[in-house]
């Protein structure tokens, strides 16, 4: 499966939208930094087949969609930017789902690496727990926004490696 060029552009647009979403100066939030334990090894793309890598990317985007679809999120971020953000995420999910369908029967390995999916879910659970503990404060959301931007940048690297594997 070839991930379309539009997918890469959508990823870039997602990062640009997130960069615009800031509401307060992040300089006031330094003390709220937190180690969410980003599962770097799941995005190295060396240890599993292409279909499994796609499923991990899909899970990360789905979890991001869920995180930013809450009422607490809607109360924090600009509605217009959020709508654009959802559109881009939806586009990426569709691309990855189409890709996963094409990979059915292409590889002998399972389409999903359950352990990797669970690792990504636990990562997002830690993010949600942090937000809850911080009572969804503006600074907590700034820290989460920075974390998600970083994770999207790292996942973009995995997507590029997948494209070079074609």
């Amino acid at each position: 499966c070839d991930l379309p060029q539009t997918h890469s552009l959508s990823n870039r647009r997602t990062l640009m939208i997130m960069a615009q979403m800031g509401r307060i100066s992040p300089f006031s939030c330094l003390k709220d930094r937190h180690d969410f334990g980003f599962p770097q090894e799941e995005f190295d793309g060396n240890q599993f087949q292409k279909a499994q890598a796609i499923s991990v990317l899909h899970e990360m985007i789905q979890q991001t969609f869920n995180l930013f679809s809450t009422k607490d999120s809607s109360a924090t971020w600009d509605e217009t930017l959020l709508d654009k953000f959802y559109t881009e995420l939806y586009q990426q999910l569709n691309d990855l789902e189409a890709c996963m369908m094409q990979e059915v029967g292409v590889e002998d390995t399972p389409l999903m690496n359950v352990d990797s999916i669970l690792t990504v879910r636990k990562y997002f659970q830690r993010i949600t727990l942090y937000l809850t503990e911080k009572k969804y404060s503006p600074c907590a959301w700034e820290v989460v926004r920075a974390e998600i931007m970083r994770s999207f940048s790292l996942s973009a690297n995995l997507q590029e490696r997948l494209r070079r594997k074609e």
């Epitope: 960069a19 937190h34 974390e147």
Partner: antibody, heavy 121, light 107 residues
Framework: EVQLVQSGAEVKKPGESLKISCKGS????????IGWVRQMPGKGLEWMGI????????AYSPSFQGQVTISADKSISTAYLQWSSLKASDTAMYYC??????????????WGQGTLVTVSS | DIQMTQSPSSLSASVGDRVTITCRAS??????LNWYQQKPGKAPKLLIY???SLQSGVPSRFSGSGSGTDFTLTISSLQPEDFATYYC?????????FGQGTKVEIK
């Protein structure tokens, strides 16, 4: 390879203006903040201020607020430190260093080589 | 501003010695403390971040500990290349502040 390359040494007279630069390469320039640190001859490190190149938001140490201006041009991955009127006491080595912002990652993990500024009449 | 106080300001040690440098913050900074090494004419180099995390490429003889207000940098077995000045820096809040430095000299 991540690099921060600073502009060359400067010799200036009191009252003159100056702008020194720090060019980042080998990483996404807008994903990291750039901090500036002063080291006067034979002395320790003093944090001056920081900039987020993605939107040019800045924060200064109270000691340097109003004394210097930090700016950035993300189109050329470069941060700047400038003075409108230099004093002899500005004589020092100035370093830039990258900072991960609100991410849980090493602070000031890469540094420029330093720019020596000498102010003398 | 958060004040950072290092001790000692200088020390003399021999190759193979265990060296300990302490840093105290004027208020709690959780674990938001970094340690840097600087050699004459060179830019500082990050050794330890968030109190105890070893920066990539830094020898394992360097270690950091502490939280709250009291922190320690330990060099388990001093090597010739370790003679330098060491700085702590609080990463908890702006303005960021450094300790005054500890110079490690050859005995």
């Amino acid at each position: 390879e991540v690099q921060l390359v600073q502009s060359g040494a400067e010799v200036k007279k009191p009252g003159e203006s100056l702008k020194i630069s720090c060019k980042g390469s080998g990483y996404s320039f807008t994903s990291y903040w750039i901090g500036w640190v002063r080291q006067m001859p034979g002395k320790g490190l003093e944090w001056m201020g920081i900039i987020d190149p993605s939107d040019s938001d800045t924060a200064y140490s109270p000691s340097f607020q109003g004394q210097v201006t930090i700016s950035a041009d993300k189109s050329i991955s470069t941060a700047y430190l400038q003075w409108s009127s230099l004093k002899a006491s500005d004589t020092a080595m100035y370093y830039c260093a990258r900072h991960p912002g609100l991410n849980w990652a090493p602070d000031f993990d890469y540094w420029g080589q330093g720019t020596l500024v000498t102010v003398s009449s | 501003d958060i004040q950072m106080t290092q001790s000692p300001s200088s020390l003399s040690a021999s190759v193979g010695d265990r060296v300990t440098i302490t840093c105290r913050a004027s208020q709690s900074i959780d674990g938001a403390l970094n340690w840097y090494q600087q050699k004459p004419g060179k830019a500082p180099k990050l050794l330890i971040y968030f109190a105890s995390s070893l920066q990539s490429g830094v020898p394992s003889r360097f270690s950091g500990s502490g939280s709250g207000t009291d922190f320690t940098l330990t060099i388990s077995s001093l090597q010739p290349e370790d003679f330098a000045t060491y700085y702590c820096q609080q990463a908890y809040d702006f303005p960021l502040t450094f300790g005054q430095g500890t110079k490690v000299e050859i005995k």
